[in-house]
């Protein structure tokens, strides 16, 4: 059965936008005016996972690209990557765990926790123009809070 999806952009709590940095990496930086068109548009799909009032499992694909954010072990450390998939098979309701993020809403802000690696979150650095990564701490220097902006399809 088809999976429900919506198109959106994400900004971290410092209002940094997410843009492509090479073919398989995202970075976060402040954008203004026409530069806002550079930010990536996600296709957020609602998928199998732990669901409650404030927690919804999602997969984050790049709109009209066969790329999904995924969480894998690299050198024994949970790592965020952009993974290429077969567009004939994705998105699907039951995504592999590495593609699943628990979208957690707290005080009008969103966190994205890895389903594969609990307590690891999509994170950005305080510094400008740095890669988006998977971080194992909340409330520290790194930013784990985001806002979501809906994009009409």
């Amino acid at each position: 059965a088809p999976v429900r999806s919506l198109n959106c952009t994400l900004r971290d709590s410092q209002q940094k936008s997410l843009v492509m940095s090479g073919p398989y990496e995202l970075k976060a930086l402040h954008l203004q005016g026409q530069d806002m068109e550079q930010q990536v548009v996600f296709s957020m799909s609602f998928v199998q996972g732990e669901e409650s009032n404030d927690k919804i499992p999602v997969a984050l694909g790049l709109k009209e690209k066969n790329l999904y954010l995924s969480c894998v072990l690299k050198d024994d450390k949970p790592t965020l990557q952009l993974e290429s998939v077969d567009p004939k098979n994705y998105p699907k309701k039951k995504m592999e765990k590495r593609f699943v993020f628990n979208k957690i809403e707290i005080n009008n802000k969103l966190e994205f926790e890895s389903a594969q690696f609990p307590n690891w979150y999509i994170s950005t650095s305080q510094a400008e123009n740095m890669p988006v990564f998977l971080g194992g701490t909340k409330g520290g220097q790194d930013i784990t809070d985001f806002t979501m902006q809906f994009v009409s399809s």
Epitope: A1, E51, K92, K97, R98
Partner: antibody
Framework: QVQLQQWGAGLLKPSETLSLTCAVY????????WSWIRQPPGKGLEWIGE???????NYNPSLKSRVTISVDTSKNQFSLKLSSVTAADTAVYYC?????????????WGQGTLVTVSS | QSVLTQPPSVSVSPGQTASITCSGD??????AFWYQQKPGQSPVLVIY???KRPSGIPERFSGSNSGNTATLTISGTQALDEADYYC?????????FGGGTK
């Protein structure tokens, strides 16, 4: 409290079509997936397929050519048809609900209906 | 077709810990579920999403899933835990049960 009540013919001849219906009482119908599972006597469980309220289906590839699952949202019911049955289709057939709160797995089951195929 | 393999039977004394395994290709990258079935009854969900317990399921039931193996653990087993146990996962667009463990 959710209840799934199922019924249908219990004795079939080879080549006939198995037909079962499951009625859902309590809880919303549109927020879930609805599944059929079977279990041959003394054997394990086999997933047959699922449907959502809009009529969108997924089937077990090994049965796909013979299976039709349909839904009647006005009655909160869903049905299974399995064509060209043989003795190998003799089993207890269960209907079940897949719920988002349990990760889209089967959290409520019907009581089961024994279907025997014999000439 | 995808295959989930379980041991046909596991035997323990009351009060001991029972571990039931379910193996399948890259199973740890999928969510695993476990059902308990007693004779003449419909299956009951005891573990969902690898390690979560539905309300009403005793704390002695726990689950884990990594690599190619999901495990259901029943600690401090009781006579009423005697049953068939089935693991359950998905493969692309369809669902698969393990063969069951008595």
């Amino acid at each position: 409290q959710v209840q799934l009540q199922q019924w249908g013919a219990g004795l079939l001849k080879p080549s006939e079509t198995l037909s079962l219906t499951c009625a859902v009482y309590g809880g919303s119908f549109s927020d879930y997936y609805w599944s059929w599972i079977r279990q041959p006597p003394g054997k394990g469980l086999e997933w047959i397929g699922e449907i959502d309220h809009s009529g969108s289906t997924n089937y077990n590839p090994s049965l796909k050519s013979r299976v039709t699952i349909s839904v009647d949202t006005s009655k909160n019911q869903f049905s299974l048809k399995l064509s060209s049955v043989t003795a190998a289709d003799t089993a207890v057939y269960y209907c079940a609900r897949a719920s988002p709160s349990s990760g889209w797995t089967l959290d409520y089951w019907g009581q089961g209906t024994l279907v025997t195929v014999s000439s | 077709q995808s295959v989930l393999t379980q041991p046909p039977s596991v035997s323990v004394s009351p009060g001991q810990t029972a571990s039931i395994t379910c193996s399948g290709d890259k199973l740890g990258d999928k969510f695993a579920f476990w059902y308990q079935q007693k004779p003449g009854q419909s299956p009951v969900l005891v573990i969902y999403l690898d390690n979560k317990r539905p309300s009403g399921i005793p704390e002695r039931f726990s689950g884990s899933n990594s690599g190619n193996t999901a495990t259901l653990t029943i600690s401090g087993t009781q006579a009423l835990d005697e049953a068939d146990y089935y693991c359950y996962a998905w493969a692309d667009t369809y669902e698969v049960f393990g063969g069951g463990t008595k």
